[in-house]
Interface confidence: low
Amino acid sequence: KESCDVQLYIKRQSEHSILAGDPFELECPVKYCANRPHVTWCKLNGTTCVKLEDRQTSWKEEKNISFFILHFEPVLPNDNGSYRCSANFQSNLIESHSTTLYVTDVKSASERPSKDEMASRPWLLYR
């Protein structure tokens, strides 16, 4: 019989290389049975994991698994670092392995995106 415990399927030592200025969705795969757990994201700062309170998140439901998504709109250079999702379920706290974002800053802060880039990647404008 399949376990009805909540499980978080972030692989150990998983990592993503992403570009500053691009949009990005960091997925926390969540398996649950009847009631969807309360899931949060945090960012590691040394040995503590700082809860990300004012960030855009959403759920994506699929047939056999759900994803709790942390949105980067767009990715900023200081988004570099390790993240963890955790679920509260029946008074238990379940924590995922950490996943690391390696952010490449494609432009120095003083450079503005070109008109071509703004047309093809309007999120570079933030608006």
Partner: antibody
Framework: QVQLRESGPGLVAPSQSLSITCTVS????????VSWVRQPPGKGLEWLGV???????NYHSVVISRLTINKDNSKSQVFLKLNSLQTDDTATYYC??????????????WGQGTSVTVSS | DIVMSQSPSSLAVSIGEQVTMSCKSS????????????LAWYQQRPGQSPKLLIY???TRESGVPDRFTGSGSGTDFTLTISSVQAEDLAVYYC????????FGGGTRLEIK
């Protein structure tokens, strides 16, 4: 210049489906998102959903089970399909060009709207 | 969903007067990452489609007269029209895009 034009059936019977086409010009559907917003008679605006340049969609939780938005980039057309209509779906339906990213965006150009009445 | 509340629901002013209207959100619309408030204001004149006036709470859309000013941060926002003109007769809606968009109920501006 940027233009959007909605075309719909006008009258739809309860429990039937509503299909509206938004034909755009002056910008590429590969690059920009298009949102659908409706306005019941004498009431306020309600965002329904969006299709982005890459084809991804987001839907309002109230209509997610009944709404499908897709598009044909080559024809510069965006399509709304809303199933199982009830009388409270009677509204003017607008399409609007979206500028920005998935969360931080504004609707900077709007169509003139198409009026839809749900009645037998 | 984030709930947007606008007040008053309607108000009447004379030409040339200043008017302010309020918009409150059920949670903060300020992103600590981008330091922007994801709030926009739209104007809908009678029988017309909505028109974007303000985004990021205070940035005027191009072509919008400078008598329109948006202000506020976090959960409390204000749209001010410094000297009302006859063509400002409209309903004004605020909209958050911090999460999937929701509109306020609107403020109807009437001319005395």
């Amino acid at each position: 210049q940027v233009q959007l034009r909605e075309s719909g059936p006008g009258l739809v019977a309860p429990s039937q489906s509503l299909s509206i086409t938004c034909t755009v010009s002056g910008f590429s559907l590969n690059t920009y998102g298009v949102s659908w917003v409706r306005q019941p008679p004498g009431k306020g605006l309600e965002w329904l959903g969006v299709v982005w340049g890459d084809g991804n969609t987001n839907y309002h939780s109230v209509v997610i089970s009944r709404l499908t938005i897709n598009k044909d980039n080559s024809k510069s057309q965006v399509f709304l399909k809303l199933n199982s209509l009830q009388t409270d779906d009677t509204a003017t339906y607008y399409c609007a060009k979206c500028y920005g990213s998935r969360f931080d965006y504004a609707m900077d150009y709007w169509g003139q709207g198409t009026s839809v009445t749900v009645s037998s | 969903d984030i709930v947007m509340s606008q007040s008053p629901s309607s108000l009447a002013v004379s030409i040339g007067e200043q008017v302010t209207m309020s918009c409150k959100s059920s949670q903060s619309l300020l992103s600590s990452r981008t330091r922007k408030n994801y709030l926009a204001w739209y104007q809908q004149r009678p029988g017309q489609s909505p028109k974007l006036l303000i985004y990021w709470a205070s940035t005027r859309e191009s072509g919008v007269p400078d008598r329109f000013t948006g202000s506020g941060s976090g959960t409390d926002f204000t749209l001010t029209i410094s000297s009302v003109q006859a063509e400002d007769l409209a309903v004004y809606y605020c909209k958050q895009s911090y999460n999937l968009p929701t509109f306020g109920g609107g403020t109807r501006l009437e001319i005395k």
